[in-house]
C-alpha cells in the first residue's frame, strides 16, 4: 500500500484542435469524496474552478468546461471547448484535487506540452506546488523531526522502487510518483485551512446500512489511463497532500464541542450525507 498519487493528462483532440480533454486519476486505496478541476493554478491558490464532481450527488461545471464525467470510480475526465481562435488552453495549467478518506486532499497539475501537435510528446517537467498546508497543525519541532524522517524514508523507498505499477504503456503520460504528507487522524481537523478539506465521514459501524457503492466502500482498482493517438503528454506538477482540515472558519473552535454534535471534528461524525459534509469541503 503505497502513498496516494494523482495523475493529470491534458489532451488536444486530433480532429478538433480547439477541443481539449483533461483526464485525472487518483491512485490510492481510499474512498474519493470529491474532485475539483481548476485551471490557471491549484484550487484556492489562484486557480479558477472548472468543475466539481461528487461520486453520488453529481457534477457541476462552468464554462469553458463542456462535460465533466467519471471515467472510473477513481478517475474523471473534463472536456473543454476553446472558443478563442488563439487557443489559450495550449499553455494553461490544469489542476485536479482529489479529496479522499483517509488520505486527505491531493492535488496535481498538468498542461499541454509546448508542441501543439496532437500525438507529439514532450518530456515532463515537474514543478512543485508549495503551500503551507501543515502550518500550525503540529508544533514546528514535531513537524520538522517527523517530517524529515518521513520524507527521508519516502525518498529512500522511492529510490529503490521500480517503475510505478500503473505507468501507462505509452510515454505520453505519466503516473506521478511524487510523495507528500497524508493525514493520520481527524483530530488535526480543528485547524483552519480553507482549501484542503476532506470527507471524514467514513463509518465502519454503519457499513451494513451504507450503500454498497457509497462512501463506505474502498475502491482499490487501478485508475484508467487514457490511451490513443490523440493523447499528448501532460506536464505534471508534484502531487500534494494535506492533513484533514475544515473549510469553515466558524468551525475552527469546533474541537471544543462534545463528540457527534453538529459538523464537528470527531473521527466518525454523522456518517453520510452532504449536509454533514459541506463543512469539510472547500469546493463545490
Amino acid at each position: 500500500a503505497g502513498t496516494p498519487e494523482v495523475w493529470v493528462q491534458v489532451q488536444m483532440e486530433a480532429t478538433e484542435l480547439s477541443s481539449f480533454t483533461v483526464h485525472c486519476g487518483f491512485l490510492g486505496p481510499g474512498s474519493i469524496s470529491l474532485v475539483t478541476v481548476s485551471w490557471g493554478g491549484p484550487d484556492g491558490a489562484g486557480g479558477t474552478k472548472l468543475a466539481v464532481l461528487h461520486p453520488e450527488l453529481g457534477t457541476r461545471q462552468w464554462a469553458p468546461a463542456r462535460q465533466a464525467r467519471w471515467e472510473t470510480q477513481s478517475s474523471i475526465s473534463l472536456a473543454l471547448e476553446d472558443s478563442g481562435a488563439s487557443s489559450p488552453f495550449a499553455n494553461t495549467t490544469f489542476c485536479c484535487k482529489f479529496a479522499s478518506f483517509p488520505e486527505g486532499s491531493w492535488e496535481s497539475c498538468g498542461s499541454l506540452p509546448p508542441s501543439s501537435d496532437p500525438g507529439l510528446s514532450a518530456p515532463p517537467t515537474p514543478v512543485p506546488i508549495l503551500r503551507a498546508d501543515l502550518a500550525g497543525i503540529l508544533g514546528l519541532s514535531g513537524v520538522l523531526l517527523f517530517g524529515c524522517g518521513y520524507l527521508l524514508h519516502l525518498l529512500r523507498r522511492q529510490k529503490h522502487r521500480p517503475t510505478p505499477r500503473l505507468q501507462p504503456s505509452h510515454t505520453n503520460s505519466q503516473a506521478l510518483t511524487a510523495q507528500a504528507w497524508a493525514p493520520s487522524q481527524a483530530s488535526q481537523a480543528a485547524l483552519h485551512d480553507p482549501y484542503a478539506t476532506i470527507n471524514t465521514s467514513f463509518c465502519p459501524a454503519t457499513l451494513d446500512t451504507a450503500h454498497p457503492n457509497g462512501w463506505a466502500s474502498l475502491p482499490t482498482h487501478a485508475a484508467h489511463q487514457p490511451q490513443g493517438p490523440a493523447a499528448s503528454a501532460s506536464t505534471p506538477i508534484l502531487a500534494r497532500g494535506s492533513f484533514v482540515s475544515v473549510e469553515n472558519g466558524l468551525y475552527t473552535q469546533a474541537g471544543e464541542r462534545p463528540p457527534h454534535t453538529g459538523p464537528g471534528l470527531t473521527l466518525f461524525p454523522d456518517c453520510r450525507g452532504p449536509r454533514a459534509l459541506e463543512g469539510r469541503f472547500g469546493v463545490r
Epitope: 464554462a63 473549510e247 452532504p274
Partner: antibody, heavy 114, light 113 residues
Framework: EVQLVQSGAEVKKPGSSVKVSCKAS????????IEWVRQAPGQGLEWMGE????????NYNEKFKGRVTITADESTSTAYMELSSLRSEDTAVYYC???????WGQGTLVTVSS | DIVMTQSPDSLAVSLGERATINCKSS????????????LAWYQQKPGQPPKLLIY???TRESGVPDRFSGSGSGTDFTLTISSLQAEDVAVYYC?????????FGQGTKLEIK
Amino acid sequence: EVQLVQSGAEVKKPGSSVKVSCKASGGTFSSFSIEWVRQAPGQGLEWMGEILPGSNSTNYNEKFKGRVTITADESTSTAYMELSSLRSEDTAVYYCARYWFAYWGQGTLVTVSS
Amino acid sequence: DIVMTQSPDSLAVSLGERATINCKSSQSLLNSGNQKNYLAWYQQKPGQPPKLLIYGASTRESGVPDRFSGSGSGTDFTLTISSLQAEDVAVYYCQNAHSYPPTFGQGTKLEIK
C-alpha cells in the same frame, strides 16, 4: 451549520423586475455554488440557474436566459437573482439552495399582479 | 433536457403501511464510468422548502429515518416508505442530478388513507 436566509416577499407589476437576495452563512461562500429554483403555486420545482461566487461563473436554464441574472457579492456572502420582464406566470416562491440542493433558503414569494 | 415523470400523482396509504413512489427519466441517469445513478429524492411539506432525502438513487441523507429507501437504476427509480408515519405526509419529488439542467419530477402527493 450552513444557513441560507432570503429576502422578504415582493409584489411587482407586469413588465418590471425583481431582485431576490440569499445570504449564506456557515460555510466558505466563494467555494460553493448557489442554485436558484422556483415553484409556482401548487406546481413543481424548476431550476433557474446557479453561480459559483468565487469566480462569478454562472449556468442558466435556457428557459430563463435573457431574463434572469444571477450575481454574488463575496464581501457580504450574498447571492442575488434578478428576473426581468415579469409576467403573471412568474408568480412563485423563489428558493436559493446550496451544495447539490442539500441546503435551502426559506423561500421568497414573488407576486406579479397589475 | 431530461424529463422526469413520477407516478402516481397522488397516493393515499394507511398509517404503518408501505408507500411506493415511482420515477422515470427520459434518459439514463447511470454513469457507466463509476456505475452510479445520479438521482435524488426530496420531501416537501406545506410552507417549507424541499428537503433532501436520498441521493445517488439509494443513499440516505444524514438524519433521514431508515424507513425511507431508494432503489432503481438507469431510467426507473423507486422511493419506498416502509411504514408510513403521520409526519411523512408531504409532496415527494425526484430529481435528475445527472446532467444540466437539473430537472425535477412533477411531484407525488402522499396522504394518509
